[in-house]
């Protein structure tokens, strides 16, 4: 059976690869794909504390 | 809103088939991950497997490429093939779909597959 | 694979305690600074309910008395003041590597 991506990285992975514009990093496969590709969790409703830090997930600027 | 809904549960023999789907809508399937998860009586929770938005599946290796999971992107659909059916395959079948994280905030009802002869 | 074990098992509370449910795994779950580590409720004959993701981020629409914490291998789930609704089975699960795999469960009971 084919091992998903991830079984085959090390603990020390480096840093996500710059993905280009209009790309977002896809954290569960480790590759750069189209942002309309993924679903970001819900946002908070107004007020709620402490907004998700920038990830690597976020299209490069 | 996502909702998923599944079906194709019920009662089958010790080495039968079974295919369960999820129809899926507030969003298209296209897009994202899409997961069978179960759960035995009275037990906790195992995943199946996923597939992704481009079609990339993977499974949990316990289950020895007897599961099988696919998509008709046309009806917005995800499909579970079960083949070589045993007893500890009994379990309520969940469809979920994660965020960017794996964290999986939208699941069906689930649907019910019980093997006995 | 990656095992997450759960502890304890099953605890007794009191509507207003503090309860902690921590959740071990094997290996880190953490990459590119993220903890790839959730948390869950379930009610008996119902569906999980995403609680905590990216081991402390508050899910939208869950009570502030949900929290969570830790890093690497290490995680815990704190409910601040248990209320009657909240007695239920808690899963963590990591999706830092194939297959994602859940602990065993906490079952939390009314004392």
């Known amino acids: 059976m084919r091992r998903g991506p991830r079984s085959l990285r090390g603990r020390d992975a480096p840093a996500p690869t710059p993905c280009v514009p209009a790309e977002c990093f896809d954290l569960l496969v480790r590759h750069c794909v189209a942002c309309g590709l993924l679903r970001t969790p819900r946002p908070k409703p107004a007020g709620a504390s402490s907004p998700a830090p920038r990830t690597a997930l976020q299209p490069q600027e | 809103e996502v909702q998923l809904v599944e079906s194709g549960g019920g009662l089958v023999q010790p080495g039968g088939s079974l295919r369960l789907s999820c129809a899926a809508s507030?969003?298209?399937?296209?897009?994202?991950?899409w997961n069978w998860v179960r759960q035995a009586p009275g037990k906790g929770l195992e995943w199946v497997g996923y597939i992704n938005y481009s079609g990339t599946t993977y499974y949990n290796p316990s289950l020895k490429s007897r599961f099988t999971i696919s998509r008709d992107t046309s009806k917005n659909t995800l499909y579970l093939q079960m083949n070589s059916l045993r007893a500890e395959d009994t379990a309520v079948y969940y469809c979920?779909?994660?965020?960017?994280?794996?964290?999986?905030?939208?699941w069906g009802q689930g649907t019910l597959v019980t093997v006995s002869s | 694979d990656i095992q997450m074990t759960q502890s304890p098992s099953s605890l007794s509370a009191s509507v207003g305690d503090r309860v902690t449910i921590t959740c071990r795994a094997s290996?880190?779950?953490?990459?590119?600074?993220?903890?790839?580590m959730h948390w869950y409720q379930q009610k008996p004959g119902k569906a999980p309910k995403l609680l905590i993701y990216?081991?402390?981020d508050l899910e939208s629409g869950v009570p502030s008395r949900f929290s969570g914490s830790g890093s690497g291998t290490d995680f815990t789930l704190t409910i601040s003041s248990l209320q009657p609704e909240d007695f239920a089975t808690y899963y963590c699960q990591q999706t830092s590597k194939d297959p994602w795999t859940f602990g065993q469960g906490t079952k939390v009971e009314i004392k």
């Open positions: 290996e880190s779950v953490d990459d590119y600074g993220i903890s790839f």
């Open positions: 979920a779909t994660p965020h960017t994280y794996g964290a999986m905030d939208y």
């Open positions: 990216r081991a402390s």
């Open positions: 507030g969003d298209s399937i296209t897009r994202g991950y």
